[in-house]
């Protein structure tokens, strides 16, 4: 019997599996870029925003050249799970100022969940362990103010955008080596 309805049919070709993950990552990247631009229009950002609870960007000079598929998938999945938590938190605790972006944040969350499912599928196909985060999960408290939630949204979308770029570049680079 085939896969249950609604679940993606996975080929036996790891390049095709990677392709599928890259496609979802690129779609999510485009959504994130669009939402980040909307955020900047509605709530202009004054400089770079950061949030201590966000994962550190995985890529640094020199790391892309030495990437291995298990490391990329594991790191990406852990980081995206963190971003999913942050998007959920933003939708829950973002306050009235972010309510106008609720449909877009909801769509972003759905895309993130879909990409995470695809990565999980790819990892099980490659018999990779479904790694849990290294660090303990920091509970996310409510933002200190309306401006605090806006700054947090800028930081989350900016970080996700860069993480997804790292992911697309890493996955496509690995595909050339398969």
């Amino acid at each position: 019997p085939g896969p249950p309805a609604g679940s993606p049919r996975v080929s036996s070709d790891p390049r095709a599996d990677l392709d599928s993950a890259v496609l979802l990552t690129r779609s999510l990247l485009a959504d994130t870029r669009q939402l980040a631009a909307q955020m900047r229009d509605k709530f202009p950002a004054d400089g770079d925003h950061s949030l201590d609870s966000l994962p550190t960007l995985a890529m640094s000079a020199g790391t892309l050249g030495s990437l291995q598929l298990p490391g990329v998938l594991t790191r990406l999945r852990v980081d995206l799970m963190s971003y999913l938590r942050h998007v959920q938190w933003l939708r829950r605790a973002g306050g009235p100022s972010l309510k106008t972006l609720e449909p877009e944040l909801g769509a972003l969350q759905a895309r993130l969940e879909r990409l995470l499912r695809r990565l999980q599928l790819l990892m099980s196909r490659l018999a990779l362990p479904q790694a849990a985060p290294d660090q303990p999960v920091i509970p996310l408290g409510p933002p200190a103010s309306a401006w605090g939630s806006i700054r947090a949204a800028h930081a989350i979308l900016g970080g996700l955008h860069l993480t997804l770029d790292w992911a697309v570049r890493g996955l496509l680079l690995l595909k050339t080596r398969l």
């Epitope: 990552t25 690129r26 485009a30 640094s60 860069l162 570049r169 595909k175």
Partner: antibody
Framework: EVQLVQSGAEVKKPGASVKISCKAS????????MDWVKQAPGQRLEWIGD????????IYNQKFTGRATLTVDKSASTAYMELSSLRSEDTAVYYC????????????WGQGTTVTVSS | DIVLTQSPASLALSPGERATLSCRAS??????????IHWYQQKPGQAPRLLIY???NLESGVPARFSGSGSGTDFTLTISSLEEEDFATYYC?????????FGQGTKLEIK
């Protein structure tokens, strides 16, 4: 106005290295990747590689791996491409170009730097 | 690497005429609604200029007489009514996989 301004023309001997700079202005430098493209006389445009200015993480076309080195100076909004072990086939115009994250299309280009390799 | 072949290599037309430039990929550069083909214009002594991205999206500031279409392996750049400043060389480029590659170009000349 969004601009990429490249360093001037270079004449080099075979075996030498060249380092080209690309100064970005008019946009947030870390919001886009910086790509480098070669255009040799009579040849098609060739992608050399790109670098994410936020992290300094480069990727390369396999053809240029080991000879091209991409770096950035975030504080100066400047990207650099160094090409080593130059040979006559490296005679070309080299462009830096602003790349959309994850999509590799190039919406802003530098004016180009001509590199001539000759003994 | 994906190879892009442009045709014709050169094309001589008059201002006001319609130009149709073709770009064929050695394998599909489309996937689930996205086509990773982009078009550039280049004039002698100048850098390339982005006209169309992701097959059919007009870059900001580019005149509406330029349009892009196609999917899979076959793509077209159309200039509906040629203006004097449109005579140049046009390149297609893909970004489906790494490395991105360019076509060899189509030179559009005044008849």
């Amino acid at each position: 106005e969004v601009q990429l301004v490249q360093s001037g023309a270079e004449v080099k001997k075979p075996g030498a290295s060249v380092k080209i700079s690309c100064k970005a202005s008019g946009y947030t430098f870390t919001d886009y990747n910086m790509d480098w493209v070669k255009q040799a006389p009579g040849q098609r445009l060739e992608w050399i590689g790109d670098i994410n200015p936020h992290s300094g993480g480069p990727i390369y076309n396999q053809k240029f791996t080991g000879r091209a080195t991409l770096t950035v100076d975030k504080s100066a909004s400047t990207a650099y491409m160094e090409l080593s072990s130059l040979r006559s086939e490296d005679t070309a115009v080299y462009y830096c170009a602003r790349g959309e994250l994850g999509h590799w299309y190039f919406d802003v280009w530098g004016q180009g730097t001509t590199v001539t390799v000759s003994s | 690497d994906i190879v892009l072949t442009q045709s014709p290599a050169s094309l001589a037309l008059s201002p006001g005429e319609r130009a149709t430039l073709s770009c064929r990929a050695s394998k599909s550069v489309s996937t689930s609604g996205y086509s990773y083909i982009h078009w550039y214009q280049q004039k002698p002594g100048q850098a390339p200029r982005l006209l169309i991205y992701l097959a059919s999206n007009l870059e900001s500031g580019v005149p509406a007489r330029f349009s892009g279409s196609g999917s899979g392996t076959d793509f077209t750049l159309t200039i509906s009514s040629l203006e004097e400043e449109d005579f140049a060389t046009y390149y297609c480029q893909h970004s489906r996989d790494l490395p991105p590659t360019f076509g060899q170009g189509t030179k559009l000349e005044i008849k």
